[in-house]
């Protein structure tokens, strides 16, 4: 039975040209995390595998950095980066947990972080 929950940074906003950290955290389970995927809509941005380490998609290499931790840092943001991001936790023995983050990239300098929320 899957008992875990994913806590994410929720709905967040950031300034064009700036950077943002996407973070998810898996809690309420003793399952072992074997791999975390970061996806933007249907595009795979990066994978962190427990055995093999990080692999960033070459298409995003110049604007995506691994970490901190199992998170992902997006740099040199553009308005095209606005949208949904997903952290997909592969675990043993539970299976797969998915968290969602919505990022809005703003032209102005009044970008603020949204509230944190949980996805069961």
């Amino acid at each position: 039975m899957m008992t875990g929950t994913i806590e994410t940074t929720g709905n967040i906003s950031a300034e064009k040209g700036g950077s943002i950290i996407l973070q998810c955290h898996l809690s309420s389970t003793t399952a072992q995390v074997t791999q975390v995927n970061w996806e933007q809509q249907d595009q795979l941005l990066a994978i962190c595998n427990a055995d093999l380490g990080w692999h960033i998609s070459p298409s995003f290499k110049d604007r995506v950095a691994p970490g901190p931790g199992l998170g992902l840092t997006l740099q040199s943001l553009t308005v095209n980066d606005t949208g949904e991001y997903f952290c997909i936790y592969h675990t043993y023995p539970d299976g797969t947990y998915t968290g969602r983050i919505f990022l809005e990239v703003l032209e102005s300098s009044v970008a603020e972080h949204g509230a944190r929320f949980q996805i069961p």
Epitope: T34, H55, S57, K61
Partner: antibody, heavy 117, light 107 residues
Framework: EVQLQESGPGLVKPSETLSLTCAAS?????????WHWIRQPPGKKLEWMGF???????VYNPSLKGRITISHDTSKNQFSLKLSSVTAADTAVYFC??????????WGQGTTVTVSS | DIQMTQSPSSLSASVGDRVTITCRTS??????LAWYQQKPGKVPKLLIY???TLAEGVPSRFSGSGSGTDFTLTISSLQPEDVATYYC?????????FGQGTKLEIK
């Protein structure tokens, strides 16, 4: 078009070190992807050996740990394999390959290495 | 290590036949399975990755399916140029491992 080409001695004596180089053309090995070595003993299945990232960090097959070293020379756009203390069991066709999320989308032509005295 | 078991080890089929090769893994690899085609005396060629995504330039008669521990490569209508050995490979952990291969021949 990305191309990989292996080179190195075709004959190595037992207990010595096997050294191979893979030259990449059409793509910079520092521009993403991982760079792998895979081998295939005569009549047998493929065996993954290890890889080097564009950053220079490495991951090896635990079965070869202590014997294998993969390095790169970014100025020549090539990466290399060293395998020490070889035996007849290391006789194989050795392939270099480009890795994307740990599958292999571009392969070299392969080079045959025989371990014999 | 994740063990990869392919079946059958060899098979013979006629041009136009539907051909199925299976790959079973010793533990859950989710969808992280690739298939390669190696023609006699040639280099392996990537056919499919992530279980079902066709690599660039691969004919649509090739398809992949499965998840977890059981996976299938299907050739919908066998062509003479499909004579080769086919390997599965997981791309999920260290060490990356291949199946022992399935040798496909034309009747």
């Amino acid at each position: 078009e990305v191309q990989l080409q292996e080179s190195g001695p075709g004959l190595v004596k037992p207990s010595e070190t096997l050294s191979l180089t893979c030259a990449a053309s059409g793509y910079s090995i520092t521009s993403g992807y991982d760079w792998h070595w895979i081998r295939q003993p005569p009549g047998k299945k493929l065996e993954w050996m290890g890889f080097i990232r564009d950053s220079g960090s490495t991951v090896y097959n635990p079965s070869l740990k202590g014997r294998i070293t993969i390095s790169h020379d970014t100025s020549k756009n090539q990466f290399s394999l060293k395998l020490s203390s070889v035996t007849a069991a290391d006789t194989a066709v050795y392939f270099c390959a480009r890795g994307l999320f740990w599958y292999f989308d571009v392969w070299g032509q392969g080079t045959t290495v025989t371990v014999s005295s | 290590d994740i063990q990869m078991t392919q079946s059958p080890s060899s098979l013979s089929a006629s041009v136009g036949d539907r051909v199925t090769i299976t790959c079973r893994t010793s533990e859950n690899i989710f969808s992280y399975l690739a298939w390669y085609q190696q023609k006699p005396g040639k280099v392996p060629k990537l056919l499919i990755y992530n279980t079902k995504t066709l690599a660039e330039g691969v004919p649509s008669r090739f398809s992949g399916s499965g998840s977890g521990t059981d996976f299938t490569l299907t050739i919908s209508s066998l062509q003479p140029e499909d004579v080769a050995t086919y390997y599965c490979q997981h791309h999920y952990g260290n060490p990356l491992t291949f199946g022992q291969g399935t040798k496909l021949e034309i009747k």
